[in-house]
Interface confidence: low
């Protein structure tokens, strides 16, 4: 079995302000066990956008039912996009650990650009 890959098919997505942005992410394997998270930006200063395991993210919905057996799709939709949402979003797979989950692999990132709202 190939080692898990985190696939973000799009390098960039452009969305008009006020619309929703769909950011796509897929895994190629169910192994290792552990949650996925979405971040904006990389490194220590990255911002958590969505955590599959816990938290409240009112603007984020998942495209697929993440609890569905054998689900490999972790795409998300972010509503009411504003220029402040522009940036590069990373889908990150974590490996279940004790006491803390450990980052396993990141997608290549999808750059979200925000167009002015059509007048």
């Amino acid at each position: 079995e190939d080692e898990l890959q985190v696939i973000q098919p799009e390098k960039s997505v452009s969305v008009a302000a006020g619309e929703s942005a769909t950011l796509r992410c897929a895994m190629t394997s169910l192994i290792p066990v552990g949650p996925i998270m979405w971040f904006r930006g990389a490194g220590a200063g990255r911002e958590l956008i969505y955590n599959q395991k816990e938290g409240h993210f009112p603007r984020v919905t998942t495209v697929s039912e993440l609890t569905k057996r054998n689900n490999l799709d972790f795409s998300i939709s972010i509503s009411n996009i504003t220029p402040a949402d522009a940036g590069t979003y990373y889908c990150v797979k974590f490996r279940k650990g004790s006491p803390d989950d450990v980052e396993f692999k990141s997608g290549a990132g999808t750059e979200l650009s925000v167009r002015a709202k059509p007048s």
């Epitope: 190939d2 696939i7 799009e10 452009s14 969305v15 769909t22 697929s64 490999l72 795409s75």
Partner: antibody, heavy 121, light 107 residues
Framework: QVQLVQSGAEVKKPGASVKVSCKAS????????MHWVRQAPGQGLEWMGW????????NYAQKFQGRVTMTRDTSISTAYMELSRLRSDDTAVYYC??????????????WGRGTLVTVSS | EIVMTQSPATLSLSPGERATLSCRAS??????LAWYQQKPGQAPRLLIY???NRATGIPARFSGSGSGTDFTLTISSLEPEDFAVYYC?????????FGGGTKVEIK
């Protein structure tokens, strides 16, 4: 009936623009991405880009950046592809094709019949 | 960009014979591969997705196999309506890319 109906053939002069439409019926228009794929005479298939009809988000192939614009009108379940600064090598059949929004549902399971765009002086 | 290479370019066979078409990816695309059939003057039609799953309404004589970089489309017994061009396509990586096609023609 689930189908994609495209606009008719076009003949354009070099430097002009063309706008092709693709009307969806029989399914929820906003539930699938719409892609555009072209095929030059006797050649293979070339992906141009997609639009998310729900959000209006777009993603274009690098080759067409700056020349292509994809839009949609959800009120009439129609997607549009406009290609500007046409050249003779843009002569092709242009197809719209739908694709599931989930990254794991990423195949073109429904195609329009194609629109022939001929660029000639 | 992932390069998809199909072989042979042309396959000359008779009705009732078995057709074996190959598709190779320049790097692993896992099982994220589709096969399409295109007849003259028509749009492509999805035959196989995820390397081995038949699309709705596709006859059982069409089957797909493979993973990683090497894939095969097999038509167990050619019917007259199967003579067409077949394309493979990967959608694991951006941008989606198609192979150059294999033409299955009547011998």
């Amino acid at each position: 009936q689930v189908q994609l109906v495209q606009s008719g053939a076009e003949v354009k002069k070099p430097g002009a623009s063309v706008k092709v439409s693709c009307k969806a019926s029989g399914y929820t228009f906003t539930g699938y991405y719409m892609h555009w794929v072209r095929q030059a005479p006797g050649q293979g298939l070339e992906w141009m880009g997609w639009i998310n009809p729900s959000s209006g988000g777009t993603n274009y192939a690098q080759k067409f950046q700056g020349r292509v614009t994809m839009t949609r009108d959800t009120s009439i379940s129609t997607a549009y592809m406009e290609l500007s600064r046409l050249r003779s090598d843009d002569t092709a059949v242009y197809y719209c094709a739908r694709e599931g929004i989930a990254a794991t549902d990423a195949y073109f399971d429904l195609w329009g019949r194609g629109t022939l765009v001929t660029v000639s002086s | 960009e992932i390069v998809m290479t199909q072989s042979p370019a042309t396959l000359s066979l008779s009705p009732g014979e078995r057709a074996t078409l190959s598709c190779r990816a320049s790097q692993s695309v896992s099982s994220y591969l589709a096969w399409y059939q295109q007849k003259p003057g028509q749009a492509p039609r999805l035959l196989i997705y995820d390397a081995s799953n038949r699309a709705t309404g596709i006859p059982a004589r069409f089957s797909g196999s493979g993973s990683g970089t090497d894939f095969t489309l097999t038509i167990s017994s050619l019917e007259p309506e199967d003579f067409a061009v077949y394309y493979c396509q990967q959608r694991l990586f951006h941008p989606p890319t198609f192979g150059g096609g294999t033409k299955v023609e009547i011998k």
